[in-house]
């Protein structure tokens, strides 16, 4: 009778994470009597995966009925595979011994490789907003994939970016890997509606890459332009002055009117109009009673946008010489929330 051989016919097995791995093993003889054990790895540090004789192995099932006396198929299935299960598995025949069974013969081993999908890419931008013409950095991270080969691309509004650096960790062998990439993006005034996209392609995704996005609306600050104009006389002795605040983003904005350097009124932008490019316009106006003034008035529109230092625009209101009318120093009636009488 030929000496027992342990045959593991598969040199390698590739399994997707979450699926079941089948590790095949047969013996060529029933003799010598003794149990089969499965190990991951070799040497003293090997990990017991299944013992036919004793123990509880909830993830392992046998392919054949091992209680059958003539059974020589010792293949096993391991359920719910994760990247941590990767390694070389050995089917080892023991011969009966007293008090302990003795290792008799090992199969050649089967390398289990686990294909694991990358996690959804997470794109994050700078902590603080930046203004057009500035360069900002975006990072993209994805984890838990195997094998190591992976492709990452950056896009801005569908256009591929080239200024980025990518690292896959760890460099050596591992059960799973992570990718980290940093892209540099130059902001323009039109980027409120823009998107930055990180795209990850991996063998497990079957040609359908994963994408992570970041909206530049979270990153960009477009400072406003100001224009102060004097409107035609609305009524006798009254002048309407407007401050046009144009092309700003985000909406958070506070406007203060100053008369000859003194605060006249402060208001917060509320009813704004949105431009096609996503920026906002807003207008504030002031009704000035010129009859109350002997001298010229310097009106200043001061805007604080998104917590930044204030910008301002001034307008000199010319006051023509005229006799002071009786009672002109009494308060005139306010005619609107954006109106202001000057005495």
């Amino acid at each position: 009778e030929e000496e027992l051989q342990v045959i593991q016919p598969d040199k390698s097995v590739l399994v997707a994470a979450g699926e079941t791995a089948t590790l095949r093993c047969t013996a060529t003889s029933l003799i010598p009597v003794g149990p089969i054990q499965w190990f991951r790895g070799a040497g003293p540090g090997r990990e017991l995966i299944y013992n036919q004789k004793e123990g509880h192995f909830p993830r392992v099932t046998t392919v054949s009925d091992l209680t059958k006396r003539n059974n020589m198929d010792f293949s096993i299935r391991i359920g719910n595979i994760t990247p941590a299960d990767a390694g070389t598995y050995y089917c080892v025949k023991f011969r009966k011994g007293s008090p302990d069974d003795v290792e008799f013969k090992s199969g050649a081993g089967t390398e289990l490789s686990v294909r694991a999908k990358p996690s959804a890419p997470v794109v994050s931008g700078p902590a603080a907003r930046a203004t057009p013409q500035h360069t900002v950095s975006f990072t993209c991270e994805s984890h838990g994939f195997s094998p190591r080969d992976i492709t990452l691309k950056w896009f801005k509004n569908g256009n591929e970016l080239s200024d980025f650096q990518t690292n896959v960790d760890p460099v050596g062998e591992s059960v799973s890997y992570s990718i980290h990439s940093t892209a540099k993006v130059v902001l323009t005034r039109e980027d409120v509606h823009s998107q930055v996209i990180c795209e990850v392609a991996h063998v497990t995704l079957q040609g359908d890459p994963l994408r992570g996005t970041a909206n530049l609306s979270e990153t960009i600050r477009v400072p406003p332009t100001l224009e102060v104009t004097q409107q035609p006389v609305r009524a006798e002795n009254q002048v309407n002055v407007t401050c046009q605040v144009r092309k700003f983003y985000p909406q958070r904005l506070q406007l203060t009117w100053l008369e000859n350097g003194n605060v006249s009124r402060t208001e917060t932008a509320s009813t704004v109009t949105e431009n096609k490019d996503g920026t906002y316009n807003w207008m504030s106006w002031l009704l000035v009673n010129v009859s109350a003034h002997r001298d010229d008035v310097k009106l200043t529109c001061q805007v604080e946008h998104d917590g930044q230092p204030a910008v301002s625009k001034s307008h000199d209101l010319k006051v023509s010489a005229h006799p002071k009318e009786q009672g002109s120093n009494t308060a005139a009636e306010n005619t609107g929330s954006n109106e202001r009488n000057i005495y």
Partner: antibody, heavy 124, light 106 residues
Framework: QVQLQQWGAGLLKPSETLSLTCAVY????????WNWIRQPPGKGLEWIGE???????NYNPSLKSRVIISVDTSKNQFSLKLSSVTAADTAVYYC??????????????????WGQGTTVTVSA | SYELTQSPSVSVSPGQTASITCSGD?????YAWWYQQKPGQSPVLVI????KRPSGIPERFSGSNSGNTATLTISGTQAMDEADYYC?????????FGGGTKLTVL
């Protein structure tokens, strides 16, 4: 501990079919092989065959063509049929259990509990 | 087919050690079982898996198995140990019994 009680016809004519039944009391029916063994008068033991709860059988090659062992899990019973009997089949027939609980593997379980035996005589 | 050979009889004085042997090709690579059968009774398992004793079997019964020979040893043999003893092993999912050994306690 499992207990076995066996019964069946004790006197047969040549060419008839021997039929014996063994009832199992106690133990988990699904963790045993169930055996039949016979012993001709004044001679040694001869293994006939075995069956487990799922109907998997092993037979002695010398008797295989004439033997059927079956199992009725609903009654916790197993049976032996031996066809075309001759005087050479005269023997005491025993049923026996082979437990294969945790820690077992093929060839690690033998016949640990035996029935009381049934004497079968084949005579014209 | 596989065969197990036992000497037909062994005699021993009370209190002495009786050794009953069973030989077969590379028997040590298989498990050996030993059964005791007294006249008119069913066999009783006394040793399983070479050297293990079922509960209820006295400690004087022991077993060993190596090479081509399995041995049942009864130390301090008593008159009640007089019986036929059968060894058994498995060959390709077939149970094989030895021819039996009659132990006589003188």
């Amino acid at each position: 501990q499992v207990q076995l009680q066996q019964w069946g016809a004790g006197l047969l004519k040549p060419s008839e079919t021997l039929s014996l039944t063994c009832a199992v009391y106690g133990g988990s029916f699904s963790t045993y092989y169930w055996n039949w063994i016979r012993q001709p008068p004044g001679k040694g033991l001869e293994w006939i065959g075995e069956i487990n709860h799922s109907g998997s059988t092993n037979y002695n090659p010398s008797l295989k063509s004439r033997v059927i062992i079956s199992v009725d899990t609903s009654k916790n019973q197993f049976s032996l049929k031996l066809s075309s009997v001759t005087a050479a089949d005269t023997a005491v027939y025993y049923c026996a259990s082979s437990h294969y609980g945790s820690g077992s593997f093929p060839d690690s379980y033998g016949m640990d509990v035996w029935g009381q035996g049934t004497t079968v005589t084949v005579s014209a | 087919s596989y065969e197990l050979t036992q000497s037909p009889s062994v005699s021993v004085s009370p209190g002495q050690t009786a050794s009953i042997t069973c030989s077969g090709d590379k028997l040590g690579d298989r498990y050996a079982w030993w059964y005791q059968q007294k006249p008119g009774q069913s066999p009783v398992l006394v040793i399983y898996q070479d050297d293990k004793r079922p509960s209820g079997i006295p400690e004087r019964f022991s077993g060993s198995n190596s090479g081509n020979t399995a041995t049942l040893t009864i130390s301090g043999t008593q008159a009640m140990d007089e019986a036929d003893y059968y060894c058994q092993a498995w060959d390709s999912s077939t149970a094989v019994f030895g021819g039996g050994t009659k132990l006589t306690v003188l």
